[in-house]
Interface confidence: low
C-alpha cells in the first residue's frame, strides 16, 4: 500500500490521543532502556509502512499483536485516514484471524512494541538524520 496519500496530521492526532497511551500500557513494567531501536524510518509514509508491517505481520516469536488495543486503533486510523487502505487489507485480515487465536505477551512482542514506539515517535518527527 502507498501511504503517501494519508492524512498525516489526523493520524498523528490519533496517535497522540490514544495509540501512544495504549503502547505505554502494553509496555508497562518494561524499562524504556531494555530494548535497542533497530528499525527506523525517514518520511511519514515510510514510517507508516514500517508501523503497519510490525503491527500486523506475524513474526517469529510474536504472532499476537493484531488484537491488541493499540493495533486495532492503528488499523482504524489507517482505514479512516489513508484512502483505499481498507480494501488492500481484506485478505490480510482473513489470514490474521486464522493465525491469531489468543493474545500472548512474549519478550519478543515487547521488543517489537518497543520498536513500534520508536517508529511512532519518528512519525511525529520525521526526517531520518542519515539515510
Amino acid at each position: 500500500y502507498d501511504f503517501t496519500n494519508c492524512d498525516f496530521e489526523k493520524i498523528k492526532a490519533a496517535y497522540l490521543s490514544t495509540i501512544s497511551k495504549d503502547l505505554i500500557t502494553y509496555m508497562s513494567g518494561t524499562k524504556s532502556t531494555e530494548f535497542n531501536n533497530t528499525v527506523s524510518c525517514s518520511n511519514r509514509p515510510h514510517c507508516l509502512t514500517e508501523i503497519q508491517s510490525l503491527t500486523f505481520n506475524p513474526t517469529a516469536g510474536c504472532a499476537s499483536l493484531a488484537k491488541e488495543m493499540f493495533a486495532m486503533k492503528t488499523k482504524a486510523a489507517l482505514a479512516i485516514w489513508c484512502p483505499g487502505y481498507s480494501e488492500t487489507q481484506i485478505n490480510a485480515t482473513q489470514a490474521m484471524k486464522k493465525a491469531r487465536k489468543s493474545k500472548v505477551t512474549t519478550n519478543k512482542c515487547l521488543e517489537q512494541v518497543s520498536q513500534l514506539q520508536g517508529l511512532w515517535r519518528r512519525f511525529n518527527r520525521p526526517l531520518l538524520k542519515q539515510q
Epitope: 518520511n43 511519514r44 526526517l127 542519515q130 539515510q131
Partner: antibody, heavy 117, light 107 residues
C-alpha cells in the same frame, strides 16, 4: 502566515566568514527541520545541510563539513548558517527552507553572498 | 549519493501547449520526489511532493507521475505565468539532491 525572513546581502573578501540568519514565524519553530540550500549565479540548487531546531542536531554534506556551521536560537526562532574560509566559488544566493518530510513548503527570500577581493 | 538527471535542460513552448519535464533517479527513491518552480530573482516554490501530490494552491494544470525511477512533471496547458525554471529534488534521505533544472521559455 508562515514566513522565513533572511538577513541582507553580504560582500566578503576571500578567507573571511559570513553568517546568514533566517527568522521563522507563523509556526512552531521546533516542529520543522531547517535546511540550507544555495544557488550560484545562473546555476542550479545545491543542498548544504539541515538542522533539527528541537535538539540542534545537524547534518552537512561532505564538501561543507569543515567550513559550514548550522545553529539555532530557539528563543528568537532563528536559524543561522555560518560559512568560513570563503572563496570566490561561494558567491551564491543562500536559502533557508523548512521541511518535515524532505520537501520544502516554505523558503526564505534568499541572501546574496558575494565573495570578491 | 543519489543523482537526479533532469531533461530537457531547456525547452521553448507556446501558451496552451502541453509540456513534459522528466527526472531520472540513479537508484530507487520510491515516491520521494518533489518539483519546484523558480522565477528569476525569486525563491523556488513547491509544486508537487511525494511524486504526485499537488502542493496547496498549485493550479490543477500541473501534475506529477512516477514510473520506476523516472518522474514526470506535466503542465497540461501552459500559461504565461508558467514560463520559469523547474527543478526536481529527491527527498528520500541525505544528502538531498536536485536535478539540473529545466528552463521553459516562450517560443
Amino acid at each position: 502566515e508562515v514566513q522565513l525572513v533572511q538577513s541582507g546581502a553580504e560582500v566578503k573578501k576571500p578567507g573571511a566568514s559570513v553568517k546568514v540568519s533566517c527568522k521563522a514565524s507563523g509556526y512552531t519553530f521546533t516542529t520543522y527541520w531547517m535546511h540550507w540550500v544555495r544557488q550560484a549565479p545562473g546555476q542550479g540548487l545545491e543542498w548544504i545541510g539541515m538542522i533539527d531546531p528541537s535538539d540542534s542536531e545537524t547534518t552537512l554534506i561532505q564538501k561543507f563539513k569543515d567550513r559550514a556551521t548550522l545553529t539555532v536560537d530557539k528563543s528568537t526562532s532563528t536559524a543561522y548558517m555560518e560559512l568560513s574560509s570563503l572563496r570566490s566559488e561561494d558567491t551564491a544566493v543562500y536559502y533557508c527552507a523548512r521541511t518535515l518530510d524532505g520537501y520544502y513548503d516554505y523558503w526564505g527570500q534568499g541572501t546574496t553572498v558575494t565573495v570578491s577581493s | 549519493d543519489i543523482q537526479m538527471t533532469q531533461s530537457p535542460s531547456s525547452l521553448s513552448a507556446s501558451v496552451g501547449d502541453r509540456v513534459t519535464i522528466t527526472c531520472r533517479a540513479s537508484e530507487n527513491i520510491y515516491s520521494y520526489l518533489a518539483w519546484y518552480q523558480q522565477k528569476p530573482g525569486k525563491s523556488p516554490q513547491l509544486l508537487v511532493y511525494f511524486a504526485k501530490t499537488l502542493a496547496e494552491g498549485v493550479p490543477s494544470r500541473f501534475s506529477g507521475s512516477v514510473s520506476g525511477t523516472q518522474f514526470t512533471l506535466t503542465i497540461s496547458s501552459l500559461q504565461p505565468e508558467d514560463f520559469a525554471t523547474y527543478y526536481c529534488q529527491h527527498h528520500y534521505g541525505t544528502p538531498w539532491t536536485f536535478g539540473g533544472g529545466t528552463k521553459v521559455e516562450i517560443k
